[in-house]
């Protein structure tokens, strides 16, 4: 028969014949021959291959290094890599999550718009008029100024984006 020039899906061409690829979780030991199908072996402990392949070595699972603030989010299998995330209070520096940095805090005058996760940093926003934040925090939103009127008080000192208003008693000497 004519040797093939292209092979079906999940096959590869070698020595003018189509051999089956190894399934995910297995590595190639020997190419197929006229007498035998492709020989594959399962990946070892802490190794994986996530595609149909002809790799002779499995990939090592990612190591979630606690010294870099990493921990295991999802344990790897023979077909999937380990997924790392960051310890509480930290987030990944990249999509690959190879290291972590401390969540950023929002300075006074800024509040938390979105709390940080293991993979994204804190998002801060400036406190708009009528709101303030007087602390540096990774959790606190901008708080609304105190409403002096609802307490039957008057504004003695105007609020800023960093300070609340100061309320005081009404001036009773006024007509």
């Amino acid at each position: 028969p004519e040797p093939p020039t292209a092979c079906r899906e999940k096959q590869y061409l070698i020595n003018s014949q189509c051999c089956s690829l190894c399934q995910p979780g297995q590595k190639l030991v020997s190419d197929c021959t006229e007498f035998t199908e492709t020989e594959c072996l399962p990946c070892g402990e802490s190794e994986f291959l996530d595609t149909w392949n002809r790799e002779t070595h499995c990939h090592q699972h990612k190591y979630c290094d606690p010294n870099l603030g990493l921990r295991v989010q999802q344990k790897g299998t023979s077909e999937t890599d380990t997924i790392c995330t960051c310890e509480e209070g930290w987030h990944c520096t990249s999509e690959a999550c190879e290291s972590c940095v401390l969540h950023r805090s929002c300075s006074p005058g800024f509040g938390v718009k979105q709390i940080a996760t293991g993979v994204s940093d804190t998002i801060c926003e400036p406190c708009p008029v009528g709101f303030f934040s007087n602390v540096s925090s990774a959790f606190e939103k901008c708080h609304p100024w105190t409403s002096c009127e609802t307490k039957d008080l008057v504004v003695q000192q105007a609020g800023t984006n960093k300070t609340d208003v100061v309320c005081g008693p009404q001036d009773r000497l006024r007509a």
Epitope: S20, V29, S30, C32, T33, F35, T36, E37, E39, L41
Partner: antibody, heavy 113, light 108 residues
Framework: EVQLQQSGPELVKPGASVKIPCKAS????????MDWVKQSHGKSLEWIGD????????IYNQKFRGKATLTVDKSSSTAYMELRSLTSEDTAVYYC??????WGQGTLVTVSA | EIVLTQSPTTMAASPGEKITITCSAS???????LHWYQQKPGSSPKVLIY???NLASGVPVRFSGSGSGTSYSLTIGTMEAEDVATYYC?????????FGGGTKLEIK
């Protein structure tokens, strides 16, 4: 011409081990796996396992795990099969074969006290 | 493992007769990795047919093979005295590779 030369008959005692050589010639030794096959007297053929001389990885028939060990010596183009803890059940002719296309002449192993 | 069942286990045929030996697999054999071997007394097995229907080098054209999936056969177009031997089918599709029990062919 492809040739697989096996050693002569072996008479071994129960519990002992035996190492059977298979010297290959007429082709590039590392290009093909070497298979090993057992044939008990008057019986069919049983595949023991194979070894890839390129990476030294062996694959075994589960039935022969712990019984057979396959190795190669690339420098002399020789494949070996060691059989251990021999019993009368291991009395048979053992063949090496280059991926089943070419076969050695067989080595008779007789286990007897 | 794939179990290969050959039939008949023994048979006698006259010279010139057409012979068919069958090999039935317990599960499908991928890419037709089914082969036939001839073994004469005191000799090692010799490939006759590989990959179901391909004639091995130096094998007389009176030998042929066919089949697919789980059902395969070896045919000798016209039996000759030198064909007296035991014939084995073998699969190279999945580990452990397995052989049929053999068919012993004798002459009448």
């Amino acid at each position: 011409e492809v040739q697989l030369q096996q050693s002569g008959p072996e008479l071994v005692k129960p519990g002992a081990s035996v190492k059977i050589p298979c010297k290959a010639s007429g082709y590039t030794f590392t290009d093909y796996n070497m298979d090993w096959v057992k044939q008990s007297h008057g019986k069919s053929l049983e595949w023991i396992g194979d070894i890839n001389p390129n990476n030294d990885i062996s694959i075994y028939n589960q039935k022969f795990r712990g019984k057979a060990t396959l190795t190669v010596d690339k420098s002399s183009s020789t494949a070996y099969m060691e059989l251990r803890s021999l019993t009368s059940e291991d009395t048979a002719v053992y063949y090496c074969a280059r991926r089943f296309a070419y076969w050695g002449q067989g080595t008779l192993v007789t286990v007897s006290a | 493992e794939i179990v290969l069942t050959q039939s008949p286990t023994t048979m006698a045929a006259s010279p010139g007769e057409k012979i068919t030996i069958t090999c039935s697999a317990s599960s499908s054999i991928s890419s037709n990795y089914l082969h036939w071997y001839q073994q004469k007394p005191g000799s090692s097995p010799k490939v006759l047919i590989y990959r179901t229907s391909n004639l091995a080098s130096g094998v007389p054209v009176r030998f042929s093979g066919s089949g697919s999936g789980t059902s395969y056969s070896l045919t000798i177009g016209t039996m000759e005295a030198e064909d007296v031997a035991t014939y084995y089918c073998q699969q190279g599709s999945s580990i452990p590779y397995t052989f049929g029990g053999g068919t012993k062919l004798e002459i009448k």
